[in-house]
């Protein structure tokens, strides 16, 4: 008689990602019965909401369960029926949502209401949605992948089984960039962290971190190109602004009032003598990349060392993973090769910024222009901050890997979200039992 | 940017039907999901049925049953089968997309069409 395949013992876990530019849910899985151990977790799906992020249908918070629909309907398809009940659901709302809630607690609560009631329509173990701190966001970042990474394991390998590990068990830095916010999380190396609001302590596998993490708030890439044009229209004569971090021959119309929406651009709030302005592109690396130093204010500091806008931040120390929009930028520009230096990264940034735009735009026919007409900022924007606001040097940019996966799981905080609500990260180290662990069975 | 043009109104008794069209000047395949709404004189754009890019549709419920969503993204189009019309349904009708896409955050379908007027009487 032919032998019986046994019912995989497995667990699934849905988290979904709702940022500022776009949502996206993704499906974790792991086996039952090794729930403890490091490493098991990955990823089997991701589904990319179309559309904006939720904090854009507060005047529309009907819409947002039609909008979550389809990708909500793929995890039904992709998790066994018999396991629904049982997966447990998280929604994590990050910067997008902490800029509403500024401005409005009351639409804040509305919008993440009308989240909670959709997502409880389906047949899944629902747990709530909630906006995350910058705090949290950058420490299960870090958490993610120095789990994928195999950072927090204590067996010790002859063989490199991921990616960038080096034997010693040094864990990475995390950086991470959204559309509104941006993330810094390391462990320094023998370093007070001279302000109690950067410091997380974290007992892991039975070791204990001290680590450094910081959230800037407006400085994600859509947020800081909305403070650099209010900067800019500040002192432009007339309602053309000539702007460096487009292509050469770009127009684009930009209504005022979209420009003072956000509470990013609240600093430079001005009354203008005109309603729109056009932006038209003049391609310059360098001009650009002068422009965005402008929202940095390094002229103060409290600490012995400051990042910018007089935040603490530790000498850097070890390896880092940039993740998210520092990887989805800098894979579209080329530039995430472990070979490719700063210096030619910035040389490659200037040609880019300096194609005229009908160049540009055959060159990616494929490419939303939308988007396509952001990348020079985008890119200059990057090595702005890298570089001038968090202190990386020629030198240790070989440190900085850029990272979109690990073992086919993304590299983002939601991993290390569930890992953590699910209780799977335990603070000692799991004895391990007979078979666990064995090379065969 | 994408144009939306309504088409297929009229005038109806109550009990008859209609079919609305609307047809984008772009690609909709992209888009998240499609809606119709409707204003009535003096009242707020309401959402009355909606399809997503993977085909799930939702509806009022004071149009349950009776409405029925479809898209043909080969042909850029939305449609509204209103059978069982009342005169409660009499409004401006108008198609969108839902959520849209941003550029820096700005919500670029929210340009809206004429619409096309739908009248239920007898």
């Known amino acids: 008689t032919q032998n019986k395949a046994l019912p995989e013992n497995v667990k699934y876990g849905i988290v979904l990602d709702a940022g500022s530019s776009h949502t996206s849910l993704y499906i974790y899985k792991w086996p039952a019965e090794k729930e403890n151990d490091t490493g098991v977790v990955h990823q089997v799906e991701e589904c990319r909401v179309k559309g904006p992020g939720i904090s854009k249908f507060v005047q529309k918070v009907n819409e947002i369960g039609i909008y979550l629909t389809d990708c909500m309907e793929r995890a039904r398809e992709v998790i066994p029926r018999s396991q629904h009940q049982e997966t447990p659901v998280y929604l994590g709302a990050t910067a997008g949502m902490r800029l509403l809630r500024m401005e409005s607690e009351e639409l804040a609560d509305r919008v993440l209401d009308v989240v909670e009631r959709s997502l409880s329509n389906y047949p899944f173990d629902f747990q709530g949605a909630r906006i995350i701190t910058g705090q949290e966001e950058g420490a299960y970042g870090w958490i993610t992948i120095n789990y994928l990474l195999g950072k927090f394991s204590q067996k010790t390998r002859w063989f490199s089984i991921v990616p960038y590990e080096t034997n010693n068990q040094e864990t990475f830095g995390a950086l991470d960039l959204g559309g509104a916010s941006t993330q810094v999380t390391f462990v320094p190396q023998n370093q007070t962290i001279e302000s109690p609001d950067n410091a997380l302590q974290f007992r892991l596998y039975g070791k204990d971190y001290n680590v450094y993490t910081h959230s800037f708030l407006c400085y994600g890439k859509d947020q800081a190109l909305w403070q650099k044009l209010a900067k800019d229209i500040q002192v432009a004569s007339n309602e053309i602004l000539r702007d460096p971090c487009f292509h050469p021959g770009y127009k684009k119309v930009v209504n005022v009032s979209d420009l003072y929406k956000t509470p990013c651009t609240k600093r430079f709030e001005m009354t203008l003598p005109f309603q729109q302005f056009e932006i038209q592109g003049i391609g310059n690396y360098q001009q650009c990349h002068q422009s965005i130093l402008e929202l940095f204010n390094t002229s103060y500091c409290p600490y012995s060392q400051c990042a910018f806008n007089g935040i603490f931040l530790p000498p850097l120390q070890g390896d880092f993973g940039a993740f998210s929009a520092f990887y989805f930028v800098m894979k579209f520009l080329n530039l995430t090769s472990e070979k490719v230096s700063q210096e030619k990264v910035t040389e490659m940034m200037k040609k880019f910024c300096a194609q005229p735009w009908e160049e540009i735009k055959t060159s990616y026919a494929g490419v939303k222009e939308k988007y396509l007409s952001e990348y020079c900022f985008s890119g200059t924007y990057i090595l702005s901050l890298l570089l001038q606001g968090y202190h990386f040097t020629a030198d240790s940019w070989e440190h900085i890997h850029f990272i979109g996966k690990i073992q086919g799981s993304d590299a983002g905080w939601t991993l290390g979200y569930m890992l953590n609500l699910t209780n799977m990260i335990p603070a000692e180290q799991p004895l391990s039992t007979p078979l666990s662990h064995s090379t065969y069975v | 940017q994408v144009q939306l043009v309504e088409s297929g109104g009229g005038s109806v008794q109550p009990g008859g039907s209609l079919k609305l069209s609307c047809a984008a000047s772009?690609?909709?395949?992209?888009?998240?999901?499609m809606g119709w709404y409707r204003q009535a004189p003096g009242k707020q754009r309401e959402l009355v049925a909606a399809?997503?890019?993977?085909?799930?549709?939702n509806y009022a419920d004071s149009v349950k049953g009776r409405f029925t969503i479809s898209r043909d993204n080969a042909k850029n189009t939305v449609y509204l089968q209103m059978n069982s019309l009342k005169p409660e349904d009499t409004a401006v009708y108008y198609c969108?997309?839902?959520?849209?896409?941003?550029?820096?955050?700005?919500?670029?379908?929210?340009?809206w069409g004429q619409g096309t007027q739908v009248t239920v009487s007898s």
């Open positions: 399809i997503t890019s993977g085909g799930y549709t």
């Open positions: 969108n997309a839902i959520g849209g896409s941003t550029w820096f955050g700005e919500d670029e379908y929210d340009n």
């Open positions: 772009g690609s909709i395949s992209s888009i998240n999901a």
